[in-house]
Structures are given as C-alpha cells and as structure tokens.
Interface confidence: low
C-alpha cells in the first residue's frame, strides 16, 4: 500500500533550489530500483516533478495560493521489469499553505456619499468594504480592521463593519459642503506587520432648510410714471437665502402699507426676485408717494429648525409716482348735437371742450379726425372747439353723422385724445309727397256714378314731428267737367270715384287724371301725379273682359279697384 499523508507546500517560495514537496513511497519498494514512480494530474511534469526511482516530488516554480490553493495529482508505482503496477493508482492532494502576501483591497477606489447637513452624531453615511485574498480560514492574514486616516473629527468608521458615520454635531453645509475622508483597511486584525489598503470617500453635505431668506437692504426705492397701466413692473427686489434648491425658494408678499391695494408683488421663479407691479391706475395729482412692507418667506419650512427664528424677512418699498403729461380730457364721453338740414354753410352746431388734466393746464387745440369725416362736411374752430358745417346737409341722405374730434395739447402735440360726436340732422319739409306707386286702373263701361275705382296712397321722404297729413285733389285744370272725382279720405289716402253713369270706350278709351298731393307742413310742398284710367268692357259682375289694347300692358294695374 501507499505510504504518505497529505502534502503541504508553502506558497511564494523564494529559494534558489527546487522546493521539496514530499515523497511517494510504496511498502513494496525494496530500494533496489525495481519500482518506477510515475506522477500525473495538476501540474505534473511541469510544476511538479518526481524522481522516478526515489519518489521524491519537487516544485519547480513559485506557487501562489491565491491563484490555486490545491493541486490534485495521481501516483503510480510500476514494476520496471514487468511494467505492471505494484500499487493501485491513487489520487493525492498538494495543499498550498497561505502566507500573508495580500493587502486588503476596497471594492471601490473612490466612494461618493451624501448626508444631510445638521445631522445628529452617529448618522449613517456609507459603508465601505475591503477584501483580502489571503486565506480567511488560517490565521489572521485575511482578518480586516477599518480605521480613519483622514476626516476626523467630522466622521468615524466602525472598525469591523466599515460603516462611516457622522461624528460632529451641527455640521453646516453653508460653512463647508465637501469632505474627503480616507479609510484604511488592515489585515492581521490590525496588528503590527499587517498589510493595508486605503480608499477615499468624498462626502457631500446635502442642504436642509436651516437658513431664512434675508433682504440685503431694509429699504428699496422705485419710481413709476402715473400712466403705468396695471401689470406694469416697476422694480425688482431680491432676498438672499444661503440654502439651495427648494430650500432657497422664496415667496414675496405685500403685508402692509398704504400701497397695499395699489401694487402687487409677483415672484420670478427663475431669478427668485420679487417684481413689484402696478395693480390699480395711479394718479400723481392724488398721491405722489406710496410705502409698502414686503415680506420674503420660504414656502417649505422644516419644523425642527423653527427654533432658529422665523423663516421670513421684510423690507420697506417706497414708490414715487412721477407726473406724466396726460392727454386732454373732454367734458363729456360723447357729444350729441343736432342741426336743421337747411342749415347754411358755416352754421355753428355746438361746441366741445377739453382741458389738460395736468397741473400745468396746457392749452389745447381741436381738430376733426378726417378718417371719420373724409368728405369734410364739418369743421371745428381749433381754438374754441366750435363745430360748424362746411357743406350743405340732407337729412334724407344721412340722418346721423358720427365724427371724431381730437383735442391736442399745443405744447405737446403727442398728447391728444378723441371724443365721438353724434350729429343728428333735423328734418325740414323740403320734399313733396308723391304717389306710393304708379297707378293705372280701369272703369267698366256700365259703371254707375260715385263708384270707387281706385284708392290712392302717398309717401313723403320727410319725417314731420306730428306725422304726415296729406291732402288730395284734382288739379285745377282738370277739376271742371271731369268724368271722375277725387274723394280725400282724410287718412292720407284718397279714392277715385266715377262721376257719371256709363262710359263709352269707343268714344274715349283712356282718361288721364292729374292729382295734386299736398303735405300739411311748413312750407307746404306739393306734387302732381297722373292716374291712368282705362275704359273696359266688363261682365255683369264687374270683371274686366276686354279693354283697349294698351291697357293690357299693365295687367297688375288693371286688376286694382275692379
């Protein structure tokens, strides 16, 4: 049988000769050289060589346990003469024995970590880990202990776990934000002679809201023209906050002051400035200076820091209203004037007045905006604002004229204002009444006297105050010996009546009746209209059967008054 124990070999041998491993030996070996020892398996013939006569094994190269801790080989003992094994082939192990030849190595060369500023002592920051390639099962070669080389008194490290914690109270980011901590990991349990490695931990203090906003000055002064419309920005104020991010966000508000209703403050989210804006229309003549109390506050507050004081600050803002040359102001928002349509050119209609509202009371001059009166029907006295006609008017063409008058400061023509003028043209009886339509009617040959054959209507372009009152009569030249009479109905209509029994169409086929229509206004206007009456043959119901050929030209006229 084979005679050996497990072989052990120290790693990292540095001698000049081959390193002796051990001896393979069979109890069949009589020492006469009849046996031949053969080695096979891990590293056989290369790393490990055997003296085939004696069975002595040597390592030819320096071995590293951390590279390969165990070699498995096979041993054979053969009878040289017969070539037969004298022992069964057997597996054996060469175990590489550890020495402390590896220092601890951290998993990262550089660690980065953050921890909130003002954290309590002992707050976890980060855990670092170092590993040692040596054999952890034998001795202390791989037993690592952590210590802090740089970073005290701010941070500490737990020797066994590598957990870094805060070690100092009230670390303030605003005072110092970045820390570089150096941690050492040492094997041999930290004892003398142990190997070590280091890592750097970059620790950043993150911000907490431990600082209130602060105005850099107690008073701000701005000025704005009185003409500034609501929404106009007039100045910017800025409180500073040592914190960052949302902890440095600031909201501005007006908390007090006589300008509370007149101004607003809005927060510019990008610049964190407070923009003072006009809220209501200002008037230099009423109030020249306003004072506001503006507050800057953090919208997000951490209750644990409230003991530091209120997270807000206030400043006084003084706003001076500047006088602005304001445009003239008319005495009315609009003027309504009226004038008779028969007014002569240069007739004064009325006047407008405007005055400069400024303290200077600059004189004004007037003009008509020709966009609104391109035909120049009206003119204005530039000095006193009197409006007068420059052309003849006609109510029946245009009842209302809408024009715009401009008042301009003489000393500053850029300052002007406008007012609408509504000019009503009053009616004058300058149009005669006339027939509402063309009248062409017919009479039956067998008509009886006083028979109504047509009703007449009249129209008049004028518009008298008391309404139209028309009168109708036959023209004087036709009144005597007429075959028809006009009956005025006194309701602005008249009827044409037959004056005799029977008409002969062969004797007279057509009658032309001149009718005078007059109105009842001053001065009286009248016109003469002609009614054509055809004589027609009718049936016994009075329906037209045949007429003079001309009468058929206007069938619509023939159908009336039948």
């Amino acid at each position: 049988s084979w005679m050996w124990n497990q072989f052990f070999l120290l790693e990292e041998y540095t001698g000049s000769d081959y390193q002796y491993v051990g001896k393979l030996h069979s109890d069949q070996d009589r020492g006469d050289g009849s046996l031949k020892y053969i080695l096979s398996g891990d590293g056989a013939g290369d790393l490990f060589i055997i003296n085939e006569n004696t069975g002595d094994i040597q390592a030819t190269k320096r071995l590293d346990r951390e590279e390969k801790p165990v070699y498995i080989l096979r041993a054979q003992a053969i009878n040289r003469r017969t070539g037969r094994p004298v022992e069964p082939e057997s597996e054996f192990i060469i175990k590489i024995h550890d020495i402390n030849d590896n220092e601890p190595i951290f998993t990262k060369e550089v660690y980065t970590a953050t921890v909130p500023e003002m954290s309590d002592v002992g707050t976890f920051v980060v855990q670092v880990t170092a590993t040692d390639a040596d054999d952890p099962t034998y001795g202390n070669s791989a037993k690592v202990v952590y210590s802090i080389l740089q970073g005290q008194p701010y941070f500490s490290v737990e020797s066994e776990t590598g957990i870094i914690k805060t070690a100092l109270l009230n670390m303030d980011r605003e005072n110092r934000e970045q820390y570089q901590v150096v941690i050492q990991a040492k094997d041999m349990g930290g004892q003398m002679g142990g190997l070590s490695g280091t890592t750097t931990v970059n620790i950043t203090l993150t911000d907490v809201n431990d600082n209130p906003p602060r105005f850099p000055q107690s008073t701000y002064q701005f000025k704005t023209p009185e003409s500034s419309p609501p929404g106009t920005p007039i100045g910017r104020i800025k409180a500073s906050d040592a914190d960052v991010g949302e902890n440095a966000e600031i909201e501005y508000s007006i908390t007090d002051g006589e300008g509370l209703d007149m101004f607003d403050v809005i927060t510019d989210q990008e610049t964190q400035e407070g923009i003072i804006t006009v809220k209501k229309l200002l008037d230099f003549e009423k109030k020249k200076v306003y004072t506001l109390k503006v507050e800057a506050s953090n919208p997000y507050v951490e209750p644990r820091f409230l003991y530091l004081g209120p997270f807000k600050d206030s400043a006084t803002v003084r706003i001076v209203v500047e006088d602005v040359d304001e445009p003239p102001v008319f005495s009315k928002l609009a003027y309504i004037l009226q004038i008779r349509e028969d007014a002569q050119i240069n007739t004064t209609i009325g006047s407008v007045t405007a005055q400069d509202p400024d303290a200077a009371r600059n004189p004004v001059k007037y003009s008509v905006d020709r966009h609104t009166d391109m035909d120049r029907i009206f003119n204005i006295d530039s000095g006193n604002g009197s409006i007068f006609t420059s052309k003849l008017l006609d109510r029946e063409t245009l009842l209302w004229h809408n024009i715009t008058v401009i008042a301009t400061e003489i000393n500053n023509p850029k300052q002007s204002s406008r007012v609408p003028l509504y000019i009503k043209v009053l009616d004058v009886n300058d149009n005669a009444p006339e027939f509402a339509e063309f009248y062409e009617t017919f009479v039956c040959e067998k008509a009886k006297a006083d028979q109504l054959i047509q009703t007449l209507h009249a129209v008049d372009k004028d518009d008298p105050y008391s309404g139209h009152q028309f009168s109708f009569s036959l023209a004087p030249e036709a009144a005597s010996g007429s075959n028809f009479t006009i009956q005025d109905n006194k309701d602005n209509t008249a009827g044409i009546l037959t004056r005799k029994n029977g008409y002969n169409r062969h004797e007279m086929s057509t009658y032309l009746l001149p009718v005078v229509i007059s109105d009842n206004d001053y001065p009286v206007q009248s016109s003469t209209g002609t009614v054509t009456v055809r004589v027609c043959a009718c049936d016994h119901h009075g329906n037209m059967q045949s007429c003079h050929a001309e009468a058929l030209i206007h069938p619509t006229g023939l159908s009336t008054g039948a």
């Epitope: 001059k365 003009s367 905006d369 020709r370 966009h371 391109m374 035909d375 120049r376 003119n379 006295d381 530039s382 000095g383 420059s390 052309k391 401009i406």
Partner: antibody, heavy 119, light 107 residues
Framework: QVQLQQPGAELVKPGASVKLSCKAS????????IHWVKQRPGQGLEWIGE????????NCNENFKSKATLTVDKSSSTAYMQLSSLTSEDSAVYYC????????????WGAGTTVTVSS | DIQMTQSPASLSVSVGETVTITCRAS??????LAWYQQKQGKSPQLLVY???NLADGVPSRFSGSGSGTQYSLKINSLQSEDFGSYYC?????????FGGGTKLEIK
C-alpha cells in the same frame, strides 16, 4: 414707407389728352384723399383738386373743372388725372400728394410728372 | 373760395440775415395753414403745419406764427441751404389754395 410713384415725363400734341398716373404704396390706399398740384415752369403751385379713393368723390378748383378728370383704380392703388384739350398753358409739372389726416398738410409728395405740350 | 396773398414775391438777402414772409387769407382760416420750401427741380417739402408747428427734422431757425387771417414764416440767421421758394397753403373749407410764393435769393 409711404410712397407715391409718378412717371417722369409725358410729351403730347396740342388738342390731345393725357392720363397721368400716381401709384401709391406703403399705406391703405382708401384711407387718404389724393390731391393734384400743378406748377408751370418758373411759376408757383396751383391746387387742382382731390379725390377720395374709397368712394370716388372729388373736389376741384373751379379753374380746372373742365380740364382735369380725377379717377382711381383701387385694385392697383393708383390715382389718375386726365387732362383734356391740351394747350401750351398745360405744359407744367404735375404732382400728386397725400395729406396728413390729423392736420391736413401735405407731407408725402410724388416726384412729379413733366407734361410738355408741343407739336 | 379763400384767396391767399403771399408777400413779398421775391427777396434778395445775405447769409446770416433774418427774413419774414407773410401770408394773408381772404377770411378766417383758423390756423389751418402750412408752409413749404421748394428747391429747383424738386417736390415741395413741409416746414410748418397748423401755422406754428415745426415739421420733423426742420431746423429751429424756422418758426411760424399767426392766427385768423394773418400768418408769417420767420427764418433766423439764414443758411445757404435755405435759399429757394416758399409757399403757404390753407386747409380750411373744401377748396384749398396756395399763396403765390416767395423766391428767396442770395444777395
């Protein structure tokens, strides 16, 4: 900017007619009256008349009523003045001009068209 | 029609002198008056409007005055570029007319 373009010159025979043009640009054509002014060589300025491009209404100096006819073509923003029965008295520079609508002075003038009546 | 009478018709003056040109209307034109300057071969250029207002870019040596029917244009300390013809024009009523003009020549 506001501009009034006029052709440089027109040569016409006595007794004939000529139609002068004035092309407007840079503003709303129908918003301003267009006026015409005559200037004989070495003489002063004579106001001929005006036309409202929006409705064609005209006002003319009595002396030119039978001589000048003012028209417009809104589609091309052009005003025209036709001079008829030309004589040597009509040889002149003819300007078109538009007035400022607030104060009614002539602040934009064309360069003028020189009309020469000669056989 | 309103007639405009301008005087003098011509004027011969030296650089540096002050001149006044007048214009009389046949009736009240309520300051609706303009003054123009015209150089040989050029279109007229506006100097003054509404009787007293200086047009943009016109030197302050020019000034207009007057009201009612009497108006004048004054040029202080004449410069060489001021020589040329000057015209008044009224804008009152429907028909507008120019004055006869004043020719300003270098003495």
């Amino acid at each position: 900017q506001v501009q009034l373009q006029q052709p440089g010159a027109e040569l016409v025979k006595p007794g004939a007619s000529v139609k002068l043009s004035c092309k407007a640009s840079g503003y709303t054509f129908t918003s301003y009256w267009i006026h015409w002014v005559k200037q004989r060589p070495g003489q002063g300025l004579e106001w001929i008349g005006e036309i409202n491009p929006s409705n064609g209404v005209t006002n003319c100096n009595e002396n030119f009523k039978s001589k000048a006819t003012l028209t417009v073509d809104k589609s091309s923003s052009t005003a025209y003045m036709q001079l008829s029965s030309l004589t040597s008295e009509d040889s002149a520079v003819y300007y078109c001009t538009i007035p400022n609508l607030l104060w009614w002075y002539f602040d934009v003038w064309g360069a003028g068209t020189t009309v020469t009546v000669s056989s | 029609d309103i007639q405009m009478t301008q005087s003098p018709a011509s004027l011969s003056v030296s650089v540096g002198e002050t001149v006044t040109i007048t214009c009389r209307a046949s009736e009240n034109i309520y300051s609706n008056l303009a003054w123009y300057q015209q150089k040989q071969g050029k279109s007229p250029q506006l100097l003054v409007y509404e009787a007293t207002n200086l047009a943009d870019g016109v030197p302050s040596r020019f000034s207009g005055s007057g009201s009612g029917t009497q108006y004048s244009l004054k040029i202080n300390s004449l410069q060489s570029e001021d020589f040329g013809s000057y015209y008044c024009q009224h804008f009152w009523g429907t028909l507008w007319t120019f004055g006869g003009g004043t020719k300003l020549e270098i003495k």
